[in-house]
Interface confidence: medium
């Protein structure tokens, strides 16, 4: 399955929107820094494309879930959020189309299941952090920056997959 060129553009637009969503300076939130333990190894280049697509799908689905909560709606600009949802939704569609075309329809390898679980646990840590910080502006800013990092890393993986074709 070939992810369309528009998928890469959509990823870049998503990152741009995340950047535009910034409301406050991270330097006013130094004490709120947190290491969420992004499972970087799960996004390594050792994956076959069949194993990668579901992990990327899980990543984007979790981002969508995180930013579509009531607390998120209160924290961010509504117009930017709507555009953000649209981009994420399109990317989910692209990845789902790949699965339907036959990539990853075989028995899920254990490695892939572990990777999806690692991504879910990562987002659980983010959700717990926000809850503990009572969804403060600084907490959301730290999370926004973290999602930019993790999304950027997963985007790099997508690009490396395209270049291997």
């Amino acid at each position: 399955c070939d992810l369309p060129q528009t998928h890469s553009l959509g990823s870049r637009r998503t990152l741009m929107l995340l950047a535009q969503m910034r409301k406050i300076s991270l330097f006013s939130c130094l004490k709120d820094r947190h290491d969420f333990g992004f499972p970087q190894e799960e996004f390594g280049n050792q994956f076959q494309k069949a194993e990668t697509i579901p992990v990327l799908h899980e990543m984007i689905q979790q981002i969508f879930n995180l930013f579509s909560t009531k607390d998120s709606s209160a924290a961010w600009d509504e117009t930017l959020l709507d555009k953000f949802y649209t981009e994420l939704y399109q990317q989910l569609n692209d990845l789902e189309a790949c699965v339907i075309q036959g990539v990853g329809v075989t028995e899920t390898p254990l490695m892939k299941e572990d990777s999806i679980l690692a991504v879910r646990k990562y987002f659980q840590r983010i959700t717990l952090y926000l809850k503990e910080k009572k969804y403060s502006p600084c907490a959301w800013e730290v999370v926004r920056a973290e999602i930019m990092r993790s999304f950027s890393l997963s985007t790099n993986l997508q690009e490396s997959l395209r270049s291997k074709e």
Partner: antibody
Framework: QVQLVQSGAEVKKPGASVKVSCKAS????????ISWVRQAPGQGLEWMGI????????RYAQKFQGRVTMTRDTSTSTVYMELSSLRSEDTAVYYC?????????????????WGQGTLVTVSS | DIQMTQSPSSLSASVGDRVTITCQAS??????LNWYQQKPGKAPKLLIY???TLQSGVPSRFSGSGSGTDFTLTISSLQPEDFATYYC?????????FGQGTKVEIK
């Protein structure tokens, strides 16, 4: 590769003000915070404050509060540091320095790109 | 403000020597600690951030360790270009503060 290019050396009289510029060439600075650090002759490094250009956030060290003003001009990718009521002990090399990452916010608050420095001499 | 105390303030060493510089914070700063190298007339250069992460392009003979209040910069085998002044810096909270510096000189 982004470079920070600072304005030239200045000689000022006590009581005067100085405005040092720091221009990002080869890239944009809007996502990055810029700190100002000074170094008196033969002395160590002293952080003066920070400006985050995209949200116009500034934070100054208490020691310079009321005397320092950091501003930015996004159209020219330039940040400025103005120090007023100069005294002889303000004689130093003034550096602008960019924070290491624009978006990653873990432990990585560090200055990876520095300007060449601007010598400000305060003398009567 | 968080005080950063470096030791020694200067040291003499030979090429090939193993050099250790320590930095102590006046309160717990987790791993929000960076190391810089500065040569005369030049701007500082970032060596290590987050207490132990080597900055891109910095030789692997440089390493950092520590957490909390006590930190160490180690140069495993001193090279001629390593003779310089080294500074630690905390970014746990503002104001960001530096150690007073350690000058590494040729013996």
């Amino acid at each position: 590769q982004v470079q920070l290019v600072q304005s030239g050396a200045e000689v000022k009289k006590p009581g005067a003000s100085v405005k040092v510029s720091c221009k990002a060439s080869g890239g944009t600075f809007s996502s990055y915070a810029i700190s100002w650090v000074r170094q008196a002759p033969g002395q160590g490094l002293e952080w003066m404050g920070i400006i985050d250009p995209s949200v116009t956030y500034t934070r100054y060290a208490q020691k310079f509060q009321g005397r320092v003003t950091m501003t930015r001009d996004t159209s020219t990718s330039t940040v400025y540091m103005e120090l007023s009521s100069l005294r002889s002990e303000d004689t130093a090399v003034y550096y602008c320095a960019r924070s290491l990452f624009p978006t990653i916010f873990g432990v990585e608050v560090a200055f990876d790109i520095w300007g060449q420095g601007t010598l400000v001499t305060v003398s009567s | 403000d968080i005080q950063m105390t470096q030791s020694p303030s200067s040291l003499s060493a030979s090429v090939g020597d193993r050099v250790t510089i320590t930095c102590q914070a006046s309160q717990d700063i987790s791993n929000y600690l960076n190391w810089y190298q500065q040569k005369p007339g030049k701007a500082p250069k970032l060596l290590i951030y987050g207490a132990s992460t080597l900055q891109s392009g910095v030789p692997s003979r440089f390493s950092g360790s520590g957490s909390g209040t006590d930190f160490t910069l180690t140069i495993s085998s001193l090279q001629p270009e390593d003779f310089a002044t080294y500074y630690c810096q905390q970014t746990y909270s503002t104001p960001i503060t530096f150690g007073q510096g350690t000058k590494v000189e040729i013996k």
